[in-house]
Amino acid sequence: ARNGDHCPLGPGRCCRLHTVRASLEDLGWADWVLSPREVQVTMCIGACPSQFRAANMHAQIKTSLHRLKPDTVPAPCCVPASYNPMVLIQKTDTGVSLQTYDDLLAKDCHCI
Amino acid sequence: ARNGDHCPLGPGRCCRLHTVRASLEDLGWADWVLSPREVQVTMCIGACPSQFRAANMHAQIKTSLHRLKPDTVPAPCCVPASYNPMVLIQKTDTGVSLQTYDDLLAKDCHCI
């Protein structure tokens, strides 16, 4: 149940895909990754107001309970709904290798 | 890559399963659910400090970038890693029906 995509907080304020440029040093990968030297990291950032991109029934419950008990129950959180793979050239015991990571770059986002 | 389960913030402060008691009225279900009248909602609540229960590579990246750019990149968030099903007796056009919801109760938690 992927609920409404209209953001009541204003354009770009709600849960959506953002791109953050990061170097291998930023990521703490400089000692084991050779390439790429810089990664365009796609990640899910933004608020999750009532029923906005609710991932499932659990997210809907969380919204209801957060409204009732905001100090106990946090609002739903903006997280990846799916991922794009990314291939790294990484150091190994014997030299270097290509390795695909399936859970590295967010592809789209929802609230949960 | 499910990283460390030791919470550096103190017992019970980090991402874990909590149970919140909620009535049908609390959940906004009173008009379409007959039973149960009260739900022990299991949900994921708590902080996600560095590498605590990191769900995957994306979560590890998020931790690194949050440390560097806390105003831009949020910390990882405590969300369900899996769910327990729940059966509801619900009203239908023709009477009542048993319906299983697979994504209603959190079973365990991780940070993403």
């Epitope: 050779l34 390439s35 790429p36 030297r37 794009n84 793979p85 990314m86 291939v87 790294l88 050239i89 190994t92 015991d93 014997t94 030299g95 270097v96 290798s97 290509l98 390795q99 695909t100 770059l105 | -």
Partner: antibody, heavy 121, light 110 residues
């Protein structure tokens, strides 16, 4: 001694299939990525694809769908399965150790001598 | 698709002279580049990897430079055994990985 030896080449009709083998000796195949490259007579080198040490495969866009790289670490052998062969696939096919743009430890230049595939009716 | 473009196609040089070969990538490949030398009937021989690192057993007259999309192979003083065809190879990685060779530069005796 570290060696790579390609085999399985020969004459095949257009539309046919062929499986090339690259038998390695002197090192443990399971630790290394392996690359296939081809060279048409009198032409340049053409990158076909790589199989990583974990078994992931990566192909040139023109090779996707027709060519498949696999490996059997227990037999210390890498394979190149070629389907729907065309006259323009006529070439010497080489296997090489590593991803080539970065060197593995030890010997930096491990190529087989190649095996000739001729596609003709 | 990644495309590697080498120039010139043919380079005529006298022994003892300097030779400069260029390779351009259609994508930013950082230093994911190697240079190979090939002589007739032989497999390619690795000269330079990681854009600028000399492979073992290769004479110091060979050097590589560049990163991103522009790369150069320099042979400081050509010897008779250096007359051959030279290929660059680039590997681009992001959501997938793909490699491509340049079309080659033939270094011939002037």
């Amino acid at each position: 001694e570290v060696q790579l030896l390609e085999s399985g080449g020969g004459l095949v009709q257009p539309g046919g299939s062929l499986r090339l083998s690259c038998a390695v000796s002197g090192f443990s195949l399971s630790s290394y990525d392996m690359t296939w490259v081809r060279q048409a007579p009198g032409k340049g080198l053409e990158w076909i694809g790589i199989i990583s040490n974990s078994g992931s495969t990566y192909y040139a866009s023109w090779a996707k769908g027709r060519f498949t790289i696999s490996r059997d670490n227990s037999k210390n052998t890498v394979y190149l399965q070629m389907n729907s062969l065309r006259a323009e696939d006529t070439a010497v096919y080489f296997c090489a150790r590593g991803i080539l743009v970065y060197a593995d430890y030890g010997d930096h230049n491990l190529w087989g001598q190649g095996t000739l595939v001729t596609v003709s009716s | 698709d990644i495309v590697m473009t080498q120039s010139p196609a043919t380079l005529s040089v006298s022994p003892g002279e300097r030779a400069t070969l260029s390779c351009q990538a259609s994508e930013d490949i950082y230093t994911n580049l190697a240079w190979f030398q090939q002589k007739p009937g032989q497999p390619p021989r690795l000269l330079i990897y990681a854009a600028s690192t000399l492979a073992s057993g290769i004479p110091a007259r060979f050097s590589g430079s560049g990163s991103g999309t522009e790369f150069t192979l320099t042979i400081s003083s050509l010897q008779s055994e250096d007359f051959a065809v030279y290929f660059c190879l680039g590997v681009y990685t992001y959501i997938s990985a793909e490699g491509a060779f340049g079309q080659g530069t033939k270094v011939e005796i002037k």
